[in-house]
Amino acid sequence: SQPQAVPPYASENQTCRDQEKEYYEPQHRICCSRCPPGTYVSAKCSRIRDTVCATCAENSYNEHWNYLTICQLCRPCDPVMGLEEIAPCTSKRKTQCRCQPGMFCAAWALECTHCELLSDCPPGTEAELKDEVGKGNNHCVPCKAGHFQNTSSPSARCQPHTRCENQGLVEAAPGTAQSDTTCKNPLEPLPPEMSGTMLM
């Protein structure tokens, strides 16, 4: 097998053997090493010498194999934009942000830039569960049979109707999507004006 060329090496077809860790330098018509994550180009390559990489300074980073001459500045998660930090910035990774609880990402440009309050789901509905929290606004779906939700809320979940018999009571009024079952003591009639769920 042919010996592997070590950067810098000449490239006539403007492509390099290892696209992730090497790049084509058009001025010199050679392939040079990229700098690993967490570093940047301190000195560019030439036909005599390879790229020299230096570690990113504190509060800066480069996430990928690169031939950047600077590191990117770490940016905090902006609470005014509804963002909160889930992981700090390192030399190899930018600050990881997410939407604050009760918010969703309203503006996305490679990453979330702006969060807004989740819409309330009205009584009788709940927010459809999403794969990723904060990814989109609430999509309210009706409570399934045997469940209810009695508030306007972005996060309240539909709860199962109370089963009166489990508490030694009897059903006074059936539950709906917006209200729980009303239970009563089997020996006492329920006054018509009472709207409580249980009478002991």
Partner: antibody, heavy 121, light 108 residues
């Protein structure tokens, strides 16, 4: 402006190690875009590139001298050094330190004034 | 290793004349990576030209460089008294870096 100054013994015995230091003033040896070089000139002759180094540690030597040469950098003193082992009379020369500004690729834009080293018993 | 041959070995001219110094490489110097230096007796070389034709900082415009491939030229349009020195070419298109043997420019 940046200036370079070589220092070291002017006389070295055969088979011993030649040691020279170059002090950088008016700028930092830790500036990223520079390589720091050694070049020599035999009496009445042309110039010979010995090699160069970057403060981070990347070092390149002339293959004809590679087995005998070692460079080092002391950023705290703003100096870089040359060690040439097993010297013979053929190593008698004026030794220059010089800077490569990588914006000029591999041309030597600043030179020290040179120091004459004689190899003799 | 790329060998550089400079000619003539010595050039005798008068102040005010035009000087043309030649540097020929043993193989093609890709991307025109050639520099020229001036060295006066007892002094370190001084960079005049890099990348074949770019003048270094502070170099008068009477100095110019040209060429490509294997043939390169340093031209001094009107010789001044301080120009009478030794001139070296240097290539950095291949490892190791090499220099020519020099051209001595003498006053006629």
């Amino acid at each position: 402006q940046v200036q370079l100054q070589e220092s070291g013994p002017g006389l070295v015995k055969p088979s011993q190690t030649l040691s020279l230091t170059c002090t950088v003033s008016g700028g930092s040896i830790s500036s990223g875009g520079y390589f720091w070089s050694w070049i020599r000139q035999h009496p009445g002759k042309g110039l010979e590139w010995i090699g160069y180094t970057h403060y981070i540690g990347s070092t390149y030597y002339n293959p004809s001298l590679k087995s005998r040469v070692a460079f080092s950098v002391d950023t705290s003193k703003n100096q870089f050094s040359l060690k040439l082992s097993s010297v013979t009379a053929a190593d008698t020369a004026v030794y220059y330190c010089a800077r490569v500004d990588t914006a000029m690729v591999d041309a030597f834009d600043i030179w020290g004034q040179g120091t004459m080293v004689t190899v003799s018993s | 290793e790329i060998m550089l041959t400079q000619s003539p070995g010595t050039l005798s001219l008068s102040p005010g004349e035009r000087a043309t110094l030649s540097c020929r490489a043993s193989q093609n110097i890709d991307s025109s990576y050639l520099a020229w230096y001036q060295q006066t007796p007892g002094q370190a070389p001084r960079l005049l030209i890099y990348d074949t034709s770019s003048r270094a900082t502070g170099i008068p415009d009477r100095f110019s460089g040209s060429g490509s491939g294997t043939d390169f030229t340093l031209t001094i349009s009107r010789l001044e008294p301080e120009d009478f020195s030794v001139y070296y070419c240097q290539q950095y298109g291949g490892s190791p870096i090499t220099f020519g043997q020099g051209t001595r420019l003498d006053i006629k």
